[in-house]
């Protein structure tokens, strides 16, 4: 897709299998062409994304496209979940597919499950 | 444009083993989301499996769990699929297809392969 | 998984012949953003499955606008307003709302 509208490049089903304790940078890649948006992180609650205050975020410049990153330092339990990327652009608001963090508490493994392991979750199937 | 050319079919002995590749052009794999489908002489399509090029990150389709296993190589914008276990009944046209995994933009199927399971 | 089901299976129709073939899911497809994955192909014999229509109602590029889809929740319909002697083939449904994919079983689409 080739336009000046901001887009958010973050796949749809996407999601992350990562580990308690461990730091996680979570970003959102968005492409726009003059004047870089304000862009948030959401967490889902049901249907409804609660936007996440107070968090550290960051930006990050490459050539063709920027990222805006939610830090997890470190990633918690409580971090499981599905995130969400939005940008406000000409007093519209740009969503992103949303993105699931699959957290496993080392304390609670053995040993850390595979990608394939992970994929085979039956609740993260439907998310 | 977006084209995949698939290799690796033929005929298998049962209890052999298949990996089917599958070469992407026109697009940089790690932005999309790449499939396994297979189709018998004369039936339905079956969805084997996915996987997403840009972290590795796999889904099956329950009876494949366990016997397929869907791999990429971004370097080479390539998928494979390797199957195991061949029996007869898995003889079949293997199609790989890619979508934009953003957008749902295109999706675009490789022209098929044929695998025979048969001693 | 969620079940796709197809009809007919088979159909006979005449070149410029309005045609629809209909599609039911076993649950919903609408998805948590609102949309709904369903997909039309068309397959050719000896050919690989081309996506004609995706999210319902998007035609791909390329696709003659005589090629239609609607529908929500569970029921959708692919239409062909006056059929041409090149669209001649088996149609599958298929949704990409839940893991895993499933296709309906096909519609094979015959001269008369």
């Known amino acids: 897709k080739e336009s000046c509208d901001v887009q958010l490049y973050i796949k749809r089903q996407s999601y992350h299998s990562i580990f308690a304790g461990d730091p996680f940078k979570l970003e959102c890649p968005v492409k726009y062409c003059a004047h870089r948006p304000q862009v948030t992180w959401c967490k889902l609650n049901g249907t409804t994304c609660v936007k996440l205050e107070g968090r550290h975020t960051s930006w990050k410049q490459e050539k063709n496209l920027s990222f805006f990153i939610l830090h997890f330092e470190p990633v918690l339990p409580s971090d499981n979940g599905s995130y969400r990327c939005s940008a406000n652009f000409l007093s519209a608001i740009i969503e992103s597919h949303s993105t699931t963090l699959y957290v496993t508490d080392v304390k609670s493994a053995s040993e850390r499950p595979s990608k394939d392991e992970m994929a085979s979750r039956p609740w993260l199937l439907y998310s | 444009e977006v084209q995949l050319v698939e290799s690796g079919g033929g005929l298998v002995q049962p209890g052999g083993s298949l990996k089917l590749s599958c070469a992407a052009s026109?697009?940089?794999?790690?932005?999309?989301?790449m499939y396994w489908v297979r189709q018998a002489s004369g039936k339905g399509l079956e969805w084997i499996g996915r996987?997403?090029?840009?972290?590795?990150?796999?889904r099956y389709a329950a009876s494949f769990k366990g016997r397929a296993t869907i791999s990429a190589d971004d370097s080479k914008n390539t998928a494979y699929l390797q199957l195991n276990s061949l029996k007869t009944e898995d003889t079949a046209v293997y199609y790989c297809?890619?979508?934009?995994?953003?957008?749902?933009?295109?999706?675009?199927w490789g022209q098929g392969t044929l695998v025979t399971v048969s001693s | 998984d969620i079940q796709m089901t197809q009809s007919p299976s088979s159909l006979s129709a005449s070149v410029g012949d309005r045609v629809t073939i209909t599609c039911r899911s076993s649950?919903?497809?609408?998805?948590?953003?609102?949309?709904?994955?369903l997909n039309w192909l068309q397959q050719k014999p000896g050919k690989a499955p081309k996506r004609l229509i995706y999210?319902?109602?998007k035609l791909d590029s390329g696709v003659p606008s005589r090629f239609s889809g609607s529908g929500s929740g569970t029921d959708f319909t692919l239409t062909i307003s006056s059929l041409q002697p090149e669209d001649f083939a088996t149609y599958y449904c298929?949704?990409?709302?839940?893991?895993?994919?499933?296709f309906g079983q096909g519609t094979k689409l015959e001269i008369k």
């Open positions: 649950q919903s497809l609408l998805d948590s953003d609102g949309k709904s994955y």
């Open positions: 297809a890619v979508y934009d995994g953003y957008y749902e933009s295109f999706d675009v």
């Open positions: 999210l319902v109602s």
């Open positions: 996987i997403d090029p840009a972290n590795g990150y796999t």
């Open positions: 026109g697009v940089n794999i790690k932005d999309t989301y």
């Open positions: 298929w949704q990409g709302t839940l893991f895993p994919r499933t």
